[in-house]
C-alpha cells in the first residue's frame, strides 16, 4: 500500500535568479485531484493554495511581487490528495541578484581560442565576497563555483566546440544573495581537428534567457532534467 504520493516538481518563473525588487512566481506541479499545495521556505510553512476545481488543476503558483534578500533561500512544496500527502519536491534555491556590485569577467588566453587550448575564466569583485559563480548561457548550461578573496579562477581545461558560448559571472555574498551579473564574455573555439570527434555546439537560448536551474544541497547548482523538459518549452515560446 502506497504511503505517499510522488513528489511534485518545483521551479521559478521566469527564473530562479531574481533581481532585487522584481517579481517571481514559484510553481509547484503535482497531480490532478490534489486538494491542497503547501510551499515551505527554509523548512517552515510559507504559503498554502487549494486549487478549485482540483480535478482540473495540477499546478499552482505562489507569487512574490518584490524580491529581496529575506525572500531568498530554499523552497520546497508538497501536495495532498484526500488524506494522502506527497513526498516533498526537490529543493528550489531562489536567489536574489543585483546586490551591491558588479564583477568583471575575463578569459585567458583570450576570447578566441583553438580547440584543445586550455582556457581559464577569471571573475573579479573587489567587495567582500569569497564565492563566485560562473554561468554559461544555453540549454546544456551549468554553474561552476569558485573561491577567492577578490578573484576566482575557473579553469575549463582543454576546450572543444562544446565550450563555445556566452559566459557571465556573479559574486555571491551568501548562497542566495548574488551580485549584479558581469558583462557577458563570448568564448569562440575555432580549430580544424583531424580524426577527433568533438561534442556538437550547444543549442542556446536568446541572450536574455538563462535556462532553469535547481540548487540541491547534495549536488550544488544543478539542472533538474525532468523539470527542464517542461520549462524549456515555456522559455522557447
Amino acid at each position: 500500500q502506497q504511503q505517499t504520493l510522488p513528489k511534485p516538481f518545483i521551479w521559478a518563473e521566469p527564473h530562479f535568479m531574481v533581481p532585487k525588487e522584481k517579481q517571481v512566481t514559484i510553481c509547484c506541479q503535482g497531480n490532478y485531484g490534489a486538494v491542497e499545495y503547501q510551499l515551505h521556505f527554509e523548512g517552515s510553512l510559507f504559503a498554502v493554495d487549494r486549487p478549485k476545481p482540483p480535478e482540473r488543476i495540477n499546478k499552482v503558483q505562489f507569487y512574490i511581487p518584490d524580491m529581496n534578500s529575506r525572500m531568498a533561500g530554499q523552497y520546497s512544496c508538497i501536495y495532498r490528495v484526500g488524506e494522502l500527502w506527497s513526498e516533498p519536491s526537490n529543493l528550489l534555491d531562489l536567489v536574489v541578484t543585483e546586490m551591491y556590485d558588479t564583477p568583471t569577467l575575463s578569459v585567458h588566453p583570450g576570447p578566441e581560442v583553438i580547440s584543445g587550448e586550455k582556457v581559464t575564466f577569471y571573475c573579479r569583485l573587489d567587495t567582500a565576497t569569497s564565492m563566485f559563480l560562473l554561468l554559461k548561457e544555453g540549454r546544456s548550461s551549468h554553474v561552476q563555483r569558485g573561491y577567492g578573496k577578490v578573484q576566482a579562477e575557473f579553469p575549463l581545461g582543454p576546450v572543444t566546440t562544446a565550450h563555445r558560448g556566452t559566459y557571465r559571472c556573479f559574486g555571491s555574498y551568501n548562497n542566495h544573495a548574488w551580485s549584479f551579473p558581469s558583462e557577458p564574455v563570448k568564448l569562440l573555439v575555432t580549430g580544424d581537428i583531424e580524426n577527433t570527434s568533438l561534442a556538437p555546439e550547444d543549442p542556446t537560448f536568446p541572450a536574455d534567457t538563462w535556462g532553469t536551474y535547481l540548487l540541491t544541497t547534495e549536488t550544488g547548482l544543478q539542472k533538474d532534467h525532468a523539470l527542464w523538459d517542461h520549462t524549456a518549452q515555456n522559455l522557447l515560446r
Epitope: S106, H108, P109, G110, P111, E112, V113, I114, S115, G116, E117, K118, P158, L188, T190, G191, D192, I193, E194, N195, T196
Partner: antibody
Framework: QVQLVQSGAEVKKPGSSVKVSCKAS????????MHWVRQAPGQGLEWIGG????????SYNQKFKGRATLTADKSTSTAYMELSSLRSEDTAVYYC?????????WGQGTTVTVSS | EIVMTQSPATLSVSPGERATLSCRAS??????LHWYQQKPGQAPRLLIK???QSISGIPARFSGSGSGTDFTLTISSLEPEDFAVYYC?????????FGQGTKLEIK
Amino acid sequence: QVQLVQSGAEVKKPGSSVKVSCKASGYTFSEYTMHWVRQAPGQGLEWIGGISPNIGGTSYNQKFKGRATLTADKSTSTAYMELSSLRSEDTAVYYCARRGGSFDYWGQGTTVTVSS
Amino acid sequence: EIVMTQSPATLSVSPGERATLSCRASQSISDYLHWYQQKPGQAPRLLIKYASQSISGIPARFSGSGSGTDFTLTISSLEPEDFAVYYCQNGHSFPLTFGQGTKLEIK
C-alpha cells in the same frame, strides 16, 4: 627554463616547400598552443597560425590557409610549420612562439630565403 | 580582422626621458593587448600582457595602460638598451594581428 629551439636556415627555390621545426623544453608541451609568426626583411610581424598539440586543433590566418600546415609531435615536444608553393615574398624569418596568454616565449627564428 | 595601428612610426627621445607609445585597435579588444620589444637580429620579447600586467624580469620602468581600442606603453626613464622597435598585438580574436611597430631611437 622554457626554451624553444628552431631548425637552421633554409634556402629554397620558388614553387618548393619548406618545413621548419621548433623543439620545446622546460614545460609540458601539450598544455600550451604553439604559434608561428613571420617577419619579412625590414617589415613587421605577421601571424601564420597556431596549433594545440594535445589534440591537433589548428587555426590559420586566412592568408596562409592551404599553403601552411602546422603539426605537432607530442613524443618529441616538437612543432612543425610547413609552407608550400614558395615565392620570393615568403623570404622572411619564421618564429615559433608559445601562447601563454600572450606570446610569452619565442624561438630564435629560422631564416627562409626563397630565390631562383 | 582587427587592424592594429601604432603611432608614431618613429619616436626620437633622449636617454633618461619618458617615452609614450600608442596603439589603437580598429574595434574593441577589451584588455587583450600585449606589447613586445624587438632588437635587431633578435626575436621579440614580451614586455606587458593584457594591457597593463607586468612581466617577471621586465624592468619596472615599462608600464602599460588602456582598454577597448586605445592603449599606451610608457617607458618612464629611457635606458640605452631600450632603443628598439616596439609592437602591440591583438590577443582578442583570430587572426592575431600586430601593429606595424614603433621605432624608438636616440635623439
